[in-house]
Interface confidence: medium
């Protein structure tokens, strides 16, 4: 349904608070370096204009598209050229090229300071102005995560304010706040990674990739829902994500609200687990639906083989309606297997498709495809074996030790990748152990495989910005569903020319002593990556010796009276002993 004024339509649908929040997120995701107050000015200008259009839809400019209105605001920013360089060239383009240009300048790794929560300062800010505090949270997260799912960020901002509402009255603010903020931080990072994968799926592999992912996921969650219903939900959900990934945050949030309403209005035919979600207010409702537990599998489902292996009409079905037939295969497989990872289900569908392509060209197709389910078995066995091996290693080494083992493994596979990226990715991979290995058997595979998909997507996104390894490019671009098996199959790079030993990378100062434990770990792990880049063939024993020497050196100097002097004297000795150990 067309509206005379798109901005008036969205303002009325969303209400002022959500409208302002979403506009702030949009500007913060595009202009990631601008100060908060600058963004607030832009938001207020656009909000006032929206109100004018609500009062009179025929007012000058109200008929303009949201991209035009947003882009015009962005292009008004005085410091655009100095702060953002060639992003300013976008302003010379017309819509829709201008918006595409802004999107292409989003930075997944902006150079912004780490957010360090100081309970007293934050509580003072919260008490002074709750609305501003809410907006500041949206701004800080959005600029660091330029693809964050906007309506979900509104949900987290409300939760964040709720934590301060509760904790700023507590006697020990820190004890109340810090664990809650840390828990939220983990959830926010996971949510950011999930949306980044959705956007990458659409951008790099087309919306069909996201649709397939959603068919599998929703069929697992809603196994009682019929294929027609799942297909409708997938179509609507894909539209929502396409809009958010494309920067159309107002449309995205509006359509997401409509989808939540539809799901709740039709919960009887979708899932028995939605009742509680549907009683909540909008943002909580949408979040709750997204996280809802899987419904029970309907009883007496016929075996998959009946329709997809035994039926003589398989090739007819496949050839006359490929997407619909493969979609129903994915739906039927997924609803029967909540214990499988979505990525594994997609691999099964891909292999099934390849089998039909091959068999349906033969003289006796049925004889060829009738054993297809035996052929698919290895796709389930492979991740199960890998999970067992890695969880055993994790249990033996603990999280930090497991991270270090992964640093060694991945630096040897792709030593060209930048050290900060290798450290970040390996640390995240190591956390999979803590997150997934403790889960019951039925939840291990989806937890592990799907979490790994998020981390490897992060690697792919960072690597795309500055490509240095053909192997990484190949694994990232060839097949979305086979990324993890592709990285698992990589062997140590024998063509790599080791880096020269750089003493600067092993020069430390007294500031290391006051770092939080996590930061200390990162310093050590950075040194480990650099060692491996210098000596990729170093044995486990050599690496162990060097790292033990390094820890002893840091402990000794941090215990010294004159720490800086100790680092100055002992540092060069460490360099010599390291080179000797690796000789």
């Amino acid at each position: 349904d067309t509206h005379k004024s798109e901005i008036a339509h969205r303002f009325k649908d969303l209400g002022e608070e959500h409208f302002k929040g979403l506009v702030l997120i949009a500007f913060s995701q595009y202009l990631q370096q601008c100060p908060f107050d600058e963004h607030v000015k832009l938001v207020n200008e656009l909000t006032e204009f929206a109100k004018t259009c609500v009062a009179d839809e025929s007012h000058a400019g109200c008929e303009k598209s949201l991209h035009t209105l947003f882009g015009d605001e962005l292009c008004k920013v005085a410091s655009l050229r100095e702060t953002y360089g060639d992003m300013a060239d976008c302003c010379e383009k017309q819509e829709p090229e201008r918006n595409e240009c802004f999107l292409s300048h989003k930075d997944d790794s902006p150079d912004l300071p780490k957010l360090k929560p100081d309970p007293n300062t934050l509580c003072d800010e919260f008490k002074a102005d709750e609305k501003k505090f809410w907006g500041k949270y949206l701004y800080e997260i959005a600029r660091r995560h330029p693809y964050f799912y906007a309506p979900e960020l509104l949900y987290y901002a409300n939760k964040y304010n709720g934590v301060f509402q509760e904790c700023c009255q507590a006697e020990d603010k820190g004890a109340c706040l810090l664990p809650k903020i840390e828990t939220m931080r983990e959830k926010v990072l996971a949510s950011s990674a999930r949306q980044r994968l959705r956007c990458a799926s659409i951008q790099k592999f087309g919306e069909r990739a996201l649709k397939a992912w959603s068919v599998a996921r929703l069929s697992q969650k809603f196994p009682k829902a019929e294929f027609v219903e799942v297909t409708k939900l997938v179509t609507d959900l894909t539209k929502v994500h396409k809009e958010c990934c494309h920067g159309d945050l107002l449309e995205c949030a509006d359509d997401r609200a409509d989808l939540a309403k539809y799901i709740c209005d039709n919960q009887d035919t979708i899932s028995s687990k939605l009742k509680e979600c549907c009683d909540k207010p909008l943002l909580e409702k949408s979040h709750c639906i997204a996280e809802v537990e899987k419904d029970a599998i309907p009883e007496n489902l016929p075996p998959l083989t009946a329709d997809f292996a035994e039926d003589k009409d398989v090739c007819k079905n496949y050839q006359e309606a490929k997407d619909a037939f493969l979609g129903s295969f994915l739906y039927e497989y997924s609803r029967r297997h909540p214990e499988y990872a979505v990525s594994v289900l997609l691999r099964l569908a891909k292999e099934y498709e390849a089998t039909l392509e091959e068999c349906c060209a033969k003289d006796d197709p049925h004889a060829c495809y009738s054993t297809v389910f035996d052929k698919l078995k290895h796709l389930v066995d492979e991740p199960q074996n890998l999970i067992k091996q890695n969880c055993d290693q994790f249990e033996k080494l603990g999280e930090y030790g497991f991270q270090n083992a992964l640093i060694v493994r991945y630096t040897r596979k792709v030593p060209q990748v930048s050290t900060p990226t290798l450290v970040e990715v390996s640390r995240s991979l190591g956390k999979v152990g803590t997150r997934c290995c403790t889960k019951p058997e039925s939840e291990r595979m989806p937890c592990t495989e799907d979490y790994l998909s998020l981390i490897l997507n992060r690697l792919c996104v960072l690597h795309e910005k500055t490509p240095v390894s053909e192997k990484v490019t190949k694994c990232c671009t060839e097949s979305l569903v086979n990324r993890r098996p592709c990285f698992s199959a990589l062997t140590p790079d024998e063509t790599y020319v080791p880096k020269a030993f750089d003493e600067k990378l092993f020069t430390f100062h007294a500031d290391i002593c006051t770092l939080p434990d996590t930061e200390k770990q990162i310093k050590k792990q950075t040194a480990l990556v650099e060692l491996l880049k210098h000596k990729p063939k170093a044995t486990e024993e050599q690496l162990k010796t060097v790292m033990e020497n390094f820890v002893a050196f840091v402990d000794k100097c941090c215990a010294a009276d004159d720490k800086e002097a100790c680092f100055a004297v002992e540092g060069p000795k460490l360099v010599v002993s390291t080179q000797t150990a690796l000789a």
Epitope: A225, E226, F227, V228, E229, T231, P302, A306, D307, D311, K312, D313, K316, N317, E320, A321, A324, F325, S328
Partner: nanobody, 126 residues
């Protein structure tokens, strides 16, 4: 829930024609795989013809190919079976069956259809 109601059966001479109808309620007929089965006295229920939902892929048993045509009218929510060149061996009770939530796949296996009509008798005799 899907309710199915067949009509149009009767007595017809060999070589004659009949058109069976199956009115569906509780479900849009274009959203579900539907089929006609038949059961002759003392015999197993057998697949006659089927049509996928969402996509109009039709299926026929070899014994009726070229003589029978399955179709549906979505606006009337009704399934049809046009039977021409009828033979005495076509004598049977004809049943309409539905497989909701399966918009594509029509199976020839009766057990895979959860919803059935009460049947309509077709007698081909001179």
């Amino acid at each position: 829930e899907v309710q199915l109601l067949e009509s149009g059966g009767g007595l017809v001479q060999p070589g004659g024609s009949l058109r069976l109808s199956c009115a569906a309620s509780g479900r849009y007929i274009d959203e579900t795989a539907v089929a006609w089965f038949r059961q002759a006295p003392g015999k197993e229920r057998e697949f006659v013809a089927g049509i996928g939902g969402g996509v109009d892929i039709t299926y026929y048993a070899d014994s009726v190919k070229g003589r029978f045509t399955i179709s549906r009218d979505n606006s009337k929510n009704t399934l049809y079976l046009q039977m021409n060149s009828l033979r005495p061996e076509d004598t049977a009770v004809y049943y309409c069956a539905a497989r909701p939530g399966r918009p594509l796949i029509t199976s020839k296996v009766a057990d895979l259809y959860p919803y059935w009509g009460q049947g309509t008798l077709v007698t081909v005799s001179s």
